[in-house]
Interface confidence: low
């Protein structure tokens, strides 16, 4: 179930998975519910420790049983993945933090007279992940509105500083607030060129782009389809980037498929979920659990129940049912998409719908912190 | 909203507007989306006005003014009144609506959290009231929803500023000693949010207050933490599922 | 002290047209639905038409939809009803009526001024 | 449009008799019903507002109940004051009297 209470003073122990800077709680949480694996996550404000490697720390955990032992630390805040929780899934992050320099990538430097209007810029900017705003009172008077653009690897900051009359936070494209605009087009047997900043397996080119969407640095893609001559490269999605923020050359090429992000779409982005489900094909991953039940639809209920699982295969061997119920497995992978897809099988595979966001199994729980 | 600023895109997706279609049509009052078909409001928005048929309810919008013929909005297929309203009292002034079709959630158009049943101990320090209200007491409707920061006020301060009326333990006030804030004609049935632990939650609904935004005059809402028990009880489905966004 | 002055009323011919006006005091005229309702001699009640406090929206009777106009100046906390195309079935007394059961900022229907007679007759 | 039917159209009663009035909506109103009183050449005073409660400083003998589409105003002991003609409004669509119940001395 969905889970949103912050666990003031306490830091999960052990489980993880990644870490990162981000500036508050709230955004650390956001990136634990995009993470494919993330279950928990634990932040270090800049007051909770003297270490300043590790102020602003963000720890996204994993965990078999979905809970690690809490030990005692002053100023920490912990919480759940709000994987699951519906409505309250969103990469849209508004806040502003006033006082804290966000580092990253400066790639583009300007003068404006507000934060609201660097923040505007950074939304209206393909490459902008998050911004540095050097208000009328910093020290230095050459800074003094200063509007600093950046990116990093990861779309987090590299580093976070506290600094006075410096106010920073994120690019809105999440909030479906761009001015850019996007390209809905899917290009058939074309593939583009430039640098690939991912690769993951998927089942066609729609689930290709939702990945690239909410992929921090993927502005475009290319998929190779099933049928793509070189066995080892079918149904892969390859996620990619550019200086210029769109591809350099396009390539007419047999059974690839190319698109952009819709990260810039104005008013509308697409779920961060894949709800299609795939007959015939089998997804390979980690097995997490094999249960039998009765249909499809009910095996990805199941999976999108279980919190860690993140897609499915139902099989229709004879040898794997009884009577009408038939086996699910339910798996996962490190980076969420599956290690393998194989087509032929008598069965159906698909996605946890755990991130979707307009299901009726989210619940706003409301339980006091635990001091 | 007066003293209020204009809001963006999204950053009150819960916000609808309750508009009635007769020879003309216009916004009467705010509301907020609490599941995928339940709109919760204020219980006098629905005073001697035409039920059902003619009342329009527009979610995922900022502006009035870029509301056309063709904008989508959804109706009504009930109106739940809180069954102690009166006329002519503040209390129990909430009401639900629960709409013809459920609406999808995008970034624009999104449910509220709601408290938890009599939640009294938490203490809500950054709370905002949005609408599309007169700016002034003799003003007009807005066309860009309004927001506006406003500090809760004790009910024993508030009842101090209303000694006509009673404010009971199911109203929470809000507003400035010096005035110059507050929700108006227009803004009633809309929300009075708190963020609380990174997430908002629906504290009051816009009900009354003497004039708009006057000193020592705070805005009276209805509490909804007061009114878990009854909200739930209304939204459940006869499947026994709640379909609206209810604490656990 | 809460008052309601009709004025306006008087003799027309089939055809003409009349204006009325409602004085209002003693209440914060801009936040209240106001009502024009009427009574023939020896005869019931008729609702005529109404106005949503911001002006914005007005309601007609049938009886009267396309004949009559209602407006409001919220500035001079006054009612008006303008009556064209008088028949003498438009014959009446016309009251106007405010809704002011309840706390501020609600809309509820119950102050009544005294009344104004319209008669319509060549 | 909604119409509302009273009855009887008039009533022959003496003081300290009960009286009732009935009212009947074409369609349902819900509660969204008041009951007023007037006398001869004078505004029409509001009794009872949303089917059941009573206006400030009515007296307690009027009490109004129903729901929907059938309406009772209820006069529990006559009194000389309470001789009059009573209207039923709905204010669930628009607004409609009924045609009015007088209410006169046998």
């Known amino acids: 179930g969905c889970l949103t209470q912050l666990y003031e003073n306490a830091f999960f122990r052990g489980g993880d998975v990644a870490s990162m800077y981000t500036p508050n709680a709230q955004y650390c949480q956001m990136r634990c519910t995009f993470h494919p694996r993330c279950l928990l996550f634990s932040f270090l404000p800049a007051s909770s420790i003297n270490d300043m490697e590790k102020r602003f720390g963000c720890f996204l955990k994993d965990s078999v049983t979905g809970t690690l032992p809490k030990v005692h630390r002053t100023g920490a805040v912990s919480g759940h993945s709000l994987k699951q929780c519906g409505h309250q899934i969103s990469a849209c992050h508004r806040d502003i933090y006033k006082g804290v320099d966000m580092r990253g990538v400066n790639f583009n430097v300007s003068k404006v007279s507000s934060v609201e209007e660097c923040q505007k810029r950074c939304t209206s900017n393909i490459r902008c992940q998050f911004f540095s705003y050097a208000t009328q009172t910093f020290h230095k008077a050459e800074y003094r509105n200063n509007c600093l653009l950046k990116y990093s690897p990861g779309g987090t900051p590299t580093a976070i500083k506290v600094l006075s009359n410096v106010e920073s936070g994120f690019s809105l494209k999440p909030c479906a607030l761009s001015e850019i605009g996007c390209h809905m087009n899917i290009f058939q047997h074309l593939a583009f060129s430039d640098v690939d900043v991912a690769r993951v397996l998927t089942p066609d080119a729609f689930v290709c782009r939702t990945i690239c969407t909410y992929h921090p640095n993927c502005l475009f893609f290319t998929f190779y389809t099933n049928v793509w001559k070189i066995e080892s490269q079918r149904n892969v999605c390859l996620l990619k980037t550019s200086e210029s923020g769109t591809p350099s050359s396009s390539t007419p090429q047999e059974n690839t498929i190319s698109g952009y992000s819709l990260l810039t779409c104005k008013r509308t982005l697409p779920e961060p979920c894949h709800s299609k489900i795939y007959p015939g094909v089998d997804f390979g991953g980690e097995e997490l659990n094999v249960t039998f039940v009765k249909g499809v639809n009910v095996c990805q209920e199941t999976c999108t129940k279980m919190i860690r699982c993140q897609f499915f295969t139902y099989s229709l061997l004879p040898e794997d049912c009884k009577e009408e119920k038939c086996k699910c497995f339910l798996r996962l992978s490190m980076d969420g998409s599956p290690t393998r897809i194989a087509y032929g099988t008598q069965g159906s595979s698909g996605y946890s719908l755990r991130l979707c966001n307009t299901g009726d199994n989210s619940v706003c729980t409301t339980k006091t912190s635990t001091r | 909203i007066v003293g209020g600023t204009n809001s963006s895109w999204g950053e009150w997706p819960w916000q609808v507007s309750l508009q009635v279609k007769l020879t003309a049509q216009r916004h009467l009052c705010g509301g907020s989306l609490i599941g995928h078909q339940w709109v919760l409001t204020a219980a006098h928005c629905f005073d001697g006005l035409p039920l059902q048929d003619v009342w329009r309810i527009y979610s995922g919008i900022l502006n009035l003014s870029d509301i056309t013929k063709d904008t989508p909005f959804s109706q009504i297929k009930e109106i739940i009144i809180h069954q102690n309203y009166k006329v002519s009292e503040g209390n129990h002034d909430i009401a639900l609506i629960k709409l013809q079709a459920p609406l999808n959630y995008t970034e624009f158009q999104k449910p509220i959290c709601l408290p938890s049943k009599g939640d009294t101990s938490t203490i809500y320090t950054n709370c905002w009231v949005t609408g599309w209200g007169f700016s002034k007491e003799k003003g007009e409707i807005q066309n860009i929803l309004q927001k506006v920061n406003i500090p809760l006020v004790t009910n024993e301060e508030c009842q101090k500023r209303y000694q006509d009326y009673k404010i009971t333990q199911r109203m929470v006030c809000a507003g400035y000693k010096e005035g110059g804030k507050d929700a108006c004609k227009g803004d009633s049935g809309g929300p009075l949010v708190c963020k609380h632990n990174g997430m908002w939650r629906l504290v009051g609904i816009t009900s009354w207050g003497e004039g708009c935004a006057r000193r020592e005059q705070p805005g009276v809402y209805t509490k909804v933490a007061e009114y878990m028990d009854w909200i739930l009880e209304k939204t459940q489905s006869s499947d026994g599922k709640a379909q609206m966004q209810s604490p656990a | 002290e809460v008052q309601l002055l009709e004025s306006g009323g008087g003799l027309v011919q089939p055809g003409g047209s009349l204006r009325l006006s409602c004085a209002a005091s003693g209440f914060t005229f801009s936040h209240y639905i106001m009502m024009w309702v009427r009574q023939a001699p020896g005869k019931g009640l008729e609702w005529v038409s109404g106005i949503y406090s911001s002006g914005g929206i007005t309601v007609y009777a049938d009886s009267v939809k396309g004949r009559f106009t209602i407006s409001r100046d919220n500035s001079k906390n006054t009612l008006y009803l303008q009556m064209n195309s008088l028949r003498a079935e438009d014959t009446a007394v016309y009251y106007c009526?405010?809704?002011?059961?309840?706390?501020?900022?609600?809309?509820?229907?119950?102050?009544w001024g005294q009344g104004t007679m319209v008669t319509v007759s060549s | 449009d909604i119409q509302m039917t009273q009855s009887p159209s008039t009533l022959s009663a003496s003081v300290g008799d009960r009286v009732t009035i009935t009212c009947r909506a074409s369609?349902?109103?819900?509660?969204?019903l008041a009951w007023y009183q007037q006398k001869p050449g004078k505004a029409p005073n509001l009794l009872i507002y949303?089917?059941?409660t009573l206006e400030s400083g009515v007296p307690s003998r009027f009490s109004g109940s129903g729901s929907g589409t059938e309406f009772t105003l209820t006069i529990s002991s006559l009194q000389p004051d309470d001789f009059a003609t009573y209207y039923c409004q709905q204010y669930n669509t628009y607004w409609t009297f009924g045609q009015g119940t007088k209410v006169e001395i046998k």
């Open positions: 009526a405010y809704r002011r059961i309840g706390v501020p900022r609600r809309d509820s229907f119950d102050m």
């Open positions: 369609q349902s109103i819900s509660s969204w």
């Open positions: 949303k089917a059941s």
